[in-house]
């Protein structure tokens, strides 16, 4: 059976049987989420056009996607380990919603979406075991995060069709520069 | 439970080249990283290279270019051919499933490789 993180299979004196870090446990973590998410792009622009749309087009949402910015110390210049690591894990949070919002917009990818979302929820708990300053992570509100589901999915087909592209280019670039970052950590 | 088992190791000459097989029996996930480590005496355990299930590989500097992962998802099997070996090659070479839904994994018996003249 599969051994859980953190722990030794019975074979304790094998090297190869002590766990993977915590290191390289994240860093798998996110390089499969962004592998599924590349899938969930292929179906998405596959789809639509929504991917040949222009910057400005793109620019023209009302969604709050999590961004990395220069404050939250995850670039080169002005680095800081625990500033990086709360905005990374608040990000993730604050992403939940818009994933939940996915599992409904893909029809031979459905599986990889509920895999990404489920991969991403143990990404926050690797993450979080990482953290010292957990009283600096903010969880969403689950109220807002319900009536913002709400209104995500009363949009038209257009509008929906960009939101889900939105969301998974927002989330490739939020992922990228995390695994920048926790590489340097 | 899911058992790992390992083949295509042995003895090879330096320039020399082997292929390495792991073959996963038992109830897997089909979202999954395959792939290899190694750990030569006395050294660390270093990742070689890993394939997720829709074939996105990743591979350790050391290796690139020389080694080449591939897998069959229909046998549940991934493969690791090595080319150019170099006596820095040598060492047991570990398969490892890594399951990103669950965040458990698990480990082969491991299979000797050994670059010598």
């Known amino acids: 059976a599969p051994v859980p993180p953190g722990e030794d299979s019975k074979d304790v004196a094998a090297p190869h049987r002590q766990p993977l870090t915590s290191s390289e446990r994240i860093d798998k973590q996110i390089r499969y989420i962004l592998d599924g998410i590349s899938a969930l792009r292929k179906e998405t622009c596959n789809k639509s056009n929504m991917c040949e749309s222009s910057k400005e087009a793109l620019a023209e949402n009302n969604l709050n996607l999590p961004k990395m910015a220069e404050k939250d110390g995850c670039f080169q210049s002005g680095f800081n380990e625990e500033t990086c690591l709360v905005k990374i894990i608040t990000g993730l949070l604050e992403f939940e919603v818009y994933l939940e919002y996915l599992q409904n917009r893909f029809e031979s990818s459905e599986e990889q979406a509920r895999a990404v979302q489920m991969s991403t929820k143990v990404l926050i708990q690797f993450l979080q075991k990482k953290a010292k300053n957990l009283d600096a992570i903010t969880t969403p509100d689950p109220t807002t995060n319900a009536s913002l589901l709400t209104k995500l999915q009363a949009q038209n087909q257009w509008l929906q069709d960009m939101t889900t592209h939105l969301i998974l280019r927002s989330f490739k670039e939020f992922l990228q520069s995390s695994l920048r970052a926790l590489r340097q950590m | 439970a899911v058992q790992l088992v390992e083949s295509g190791g042995g003895l090879v000459q330096p320039g020399g080249s082997l292929r390495l097989s792991c073959a996963a029996s038992?109830?897997?996930?089909?979202?999954?990283?395959m792939g290899w480590y190694r750990q030569a005496p006395g050294k660390q355990r270093e990742l070689v290279a890993d394939?997720?299930?829709?074939?996105?590989?990743n591979y350790a500097d050391s290796v690139k270019g020389r080694f080449t992962i591939s897998r069959d998802n229909t046998k549940n099997t991934v493969y690791l051919q090595m080319n150019s070996l170099k006596p820095d090659d040598t060492a047991v070479y570990y398969c490892?499933?890594?399951?990103?839904?669950?965040?458990?994994?698990?480990w082969g018996q491991g299979t000797q490789v050994t670059v010598s003249s």
């Open positions: 490892h499933t890594y399951y990103p839904t669950t965040g458990f994994d698990d």
């Open positions: 038992g109830s897997i996930s089909r979202f999954n990283i």
């Open positions: 394939i997720t299930n829709r074939g996105t590989t």
